[in-house]
């Protein structure tokens, strides 16, 4: 069964800066990745970035830099101030559309006890949905 993992980290240097890393653990070919916050994409969440393996990357504030880390994992740096700033309990979700498995989505947030600059290891996140 495919899995999606999500890792959220607050940067030590800037407390309003977050890094989200997501990966797809499956054998299929990824056709699109959507990163959202505030909940799953299409279920109250707001899209931060869309990454297509061949068409490129689109992102919207407070996303600052989205990129492919490998063929099956991505990272996104968020920088916020004021209303658009993420907070420690913000939920971030990553949805991977792949062939032939379909769409798989997982969500995660900053570990409650994490110090700036630290993060939980990238394990499959608890919220997992297949379309």
């Amino acid at each position: 069964t495919p899995e999606v993992w999500v890792q959220v980290r607050m940067e030590a240097t800037e407390l309003s800066s977050f890094t989200i890393r997501c990966g797809f653990l499956g054998s299929g070919s990824i056709s699109l990745v959507t990163v959202s916050w505030g909940g799953p994409n299409g279920a109250g969440g707001t899209t931060l970035a869309v990454l297509h393996p061949e068409r490129g990357i689109r992102q919207w504030a407070p996303a600052r830099q989205a990129r492919w880390e490998t063929q099956s994992s991505i990272s996104l740096i968020l920088e916020g101030s004021g209303a658009s700033s993420p907070c420690a309990n913000t939920t971030f979700c990553c949805k991977f559309a792949s062939f032939p498995e379909g769409s798989w989505e997982a969500c995660g947030s900053l570990p409650p006890s994490s110090d700036p600059g630290l993060s939980a290891p990238p394990t499959p996140a608890p919220i997992l949905r297949a379309d």
Epitope: T47, H52, P53, E54, R55, G56, I57, W60, R67, W68
Partner: antibody, heavy 114, light 113 residues
Framework: QVQLQQPGAELVKPGTSVKLSCKAS?????SYWINWVKLRPGQGLEW???????????NYNEKFKNKATLTVDTSSSTAYMQLTSLASEDSALYYC???????WGAGTTVTVSS | DIVMTQSPDSLAVSLGERATINCKSS????????????LAWYQQKPGQPPKLLIY???TRESGVPDRFSGSGSGTDFTLTISSLQAEDVAVYYC?????????FGQGTKLEIK
Amino acid sequence: QVQLQQPGAELVKPGTSVKLSCKASGYTFTSYWINWVKLRPGQGLEWIGDIYPGSYIPNYNEKFKNKATLTVDTSSSTAYMQLTSLASEDSALYYCAGGYFDVWGAGTTVTVSS
Amino acid sequence: DIVMTQSPDSLAVSLGERATINCKSSQSLLSSGNQKNYLAWYQQKPGQPPKLLIYGASTRESGVPDRFSGSGSGTDFTLTISSLQAEDVAVYYCQNDHSYPYTFGQGTKLEIK
């Protein structure tokens, strides 16, 4: 099928503003971002910016930051681009294009003339 | 900004012959993480909006005839029409799909010789 509808032409006076529309149909409007592109004869295509209707948040080409304002009305599935302080160099054909530029509107010709 | 430069500016080719358009970017369009080139090609016929032909430097959009092909990597790319047809007369643009702002080449006008 996915369609983007734009009015054919706008004739405006120098120094005024114009608000161009792009009505989307055939898909969920909030799940597909809208780009705006300028075409002037002999000058090629220029990307003005994009906006994601789900978050109302735009990105701008720095060159157009003080010229264009991108907005959306999700209730009518329409994207708008307002152009201000119009001058002769703003006379052009303006296209809206969906997502990764795979669907285009027919374009609106803006003519700035007194 | 990434500057896209096409050559030639205009091109006249006989029907059935090969047409080649080059595009050079001022920065690499290769994504190091997934080794994909983010470059697209568009065709614009008179009185029509641009039409996506090729993305990812070499992937044909659905419905595009196989006489159109794209190649290249990094900063140098090529659009090839293997056997020119009358309906291919148009202006062709390359586009940086890699990073904001999404810049286009100046266009290459393709005509029948």
